[in-house]
Interface confidence: low
């Protein structure tokens, strides 16, 4: 396994409607064919993956149908969507990129974005 | 209606090579990613891979990377499935299955299966 | 990967019983579906995202859970009911089964 470096902004703040998007970039040392880019959430040193895309170089970066991720690549950039945030979901998201395919192996883990979650204040009830 | 026809048994020796198909019919074959799920006898399921007909990308289950290869003949609305350097445990039934989206549930159509035998 | 363990493996019980089927993953998972299978036949898809009845599956079949705890509950069985029911995750790849829970008649 071959170290890779990985950049993702430090900071982003979800937006009211609980969607934060940053890119995510790596410095691919050769023409990987297929791609795995994964998110995970780290919070109270607990990590958990929140969402992972396998894609080929030149295509549509897709999530799987269960994902709250969305996502589109071009070049080494991965531009990273995701949805349905609440304030309880603030936390650090770290960007993770395999290149999988051909050999060699390499694996990359960014330094991580705080995602800044704010719940909007509830209306309240309206006639109109 | 949506039908996904497979081909028929295959047996096979020890480090040959299979080559399966899939017959998709009764909605757009471009508008779905198909997948492969295979099932020893009085075995659990087995996620293989799924390959995109449109753009032709594939992911694979790393346990079949580089032995399983994924190809579309959109023409003909087929998918099919090589795998190589067969193995006595490769001895299965093969399932395509069709993915969803967010309005079609995932996996709601499968193939009838086709049993591939490896022996010597 | 995600590892999908059903418990039991085999559960023995009698047409008009309550039957608990249970699926726990190794990681959270955003949804769980469930699949039937008869022998000799294709897996059907049963309940997905959690909770939704496939297309002709009875109102006796629910789904619930969150996270890493999943369960598949047949509130009165009937005796088409007694088959063998796959969990599935599609959170990540590779996308993953429990072993499965053969429900048979006691």
């Known amino acids: 396994c071959k170290a890779m470096h990985v950049a993702q902004p430090a900071v982003v703040l979800a937006s009211s409607r609980g969607i934060a998007s940053f890119v995510c970039e790596y410095a691919s040392p050769g023409k990987a064919t297929e791609v795995r880019v994964t998110v995970l959430r780290q919070a109270d040193s607990q990590v958990t993956e929140v969402c992972a895309a396998t894609y080929m170089m030149g295509n549509e970066l897709t999530f799987l149908d269960d994902s709250i991720c969305t996502g589109t690549s071009s070049g080494n950039q991965v531009n990273l969507t995701i949805q349905g945030l609440r304030a309880m979901d603030t936390g650090l998201y770290i960007c993770k990129v395999e290149l999988m395919y051909p050999p060699p192996y390499y694996l990359g883990i960014g330094n991580g974005t705080q995602i800044y979650v704010i719940d909007p204040e509830p209306c309240p009830d309206s006639d109109f | 209606e949506v039908q996904l026809v497979q081909s028929g048994a295959e047996l096979k020796k020890p480090g040959a090579s299979v080559k399966m198909s899939c017959k998709a019919s009764?909605?757009?074959?471009?508008?779905?990613?198909m997948d492969w799920v295979r099932q020893a006898h009085g075995k659990g399921l087995e996620w293989i891979g799924n390959?995109?007909?449109?753009?032709?990308?594939?992911s694979y289950n790393q346990k079949f990377k580089g032995r399983a290869t994924l190809t579309v003949d959109k023409s003909s609305s087929t998918a099919y499935m090589e795998l190589r350097s067969l193995r006595s445990d490769d001895t299965a039934v093969y399932y395509c299955?069709?993915?969803?989206?967010?309005?079609?549930?995932?996996?709601?159509?499968w193939g009838q299966g086709t049993l591939v035998t490896v022996s010597s | 990967e995600i590892v999908l363990t059903q418990s039991p493996a085999t559960l023995s019980l009698s047409p008009g019983e309550r039957a608990t089927l249970s699926c726990s993953a190794s990681?959270?998972?955003?949804?769980m579906h469930w699949f039937q299978q008869k022998p000799g036949k294709a897996p059907k898809l049963w309940i997905y995202?959690?909770?939704i009845l496939a297309s002709g599956v009875p109102a006796r079949f629910s789904g619930s859970g969150s996270g890493t705890d999943y369960t598949l509950t047949i509130s009165r069985l009937e005796p088409e009911d007694f088959a063998t029911y796959y969990c599935?995750?599609?959170?990540?790849?590779?996308?993953?089964f429990g072993q499965g829970t053969k429900l048979e008649i006691k």
């Open positions: 390959i995109n007909p449109n753009s032709e990308s594939t």
């Open positions: 995202s959690t909770s």
């Open positions: 599935q995750q599609r959170t990540s790849y590779p996308l993953t």
């Open positions: 990681s959270s998972v955003t949804y």
């Open positions: 299955t069709r993915d969803g989206n967010r309005y079609d549930a995932w996996f709601a159509y």
């Open positions: 009764g909605y757009t074959f471009t508008d779905y990613n």
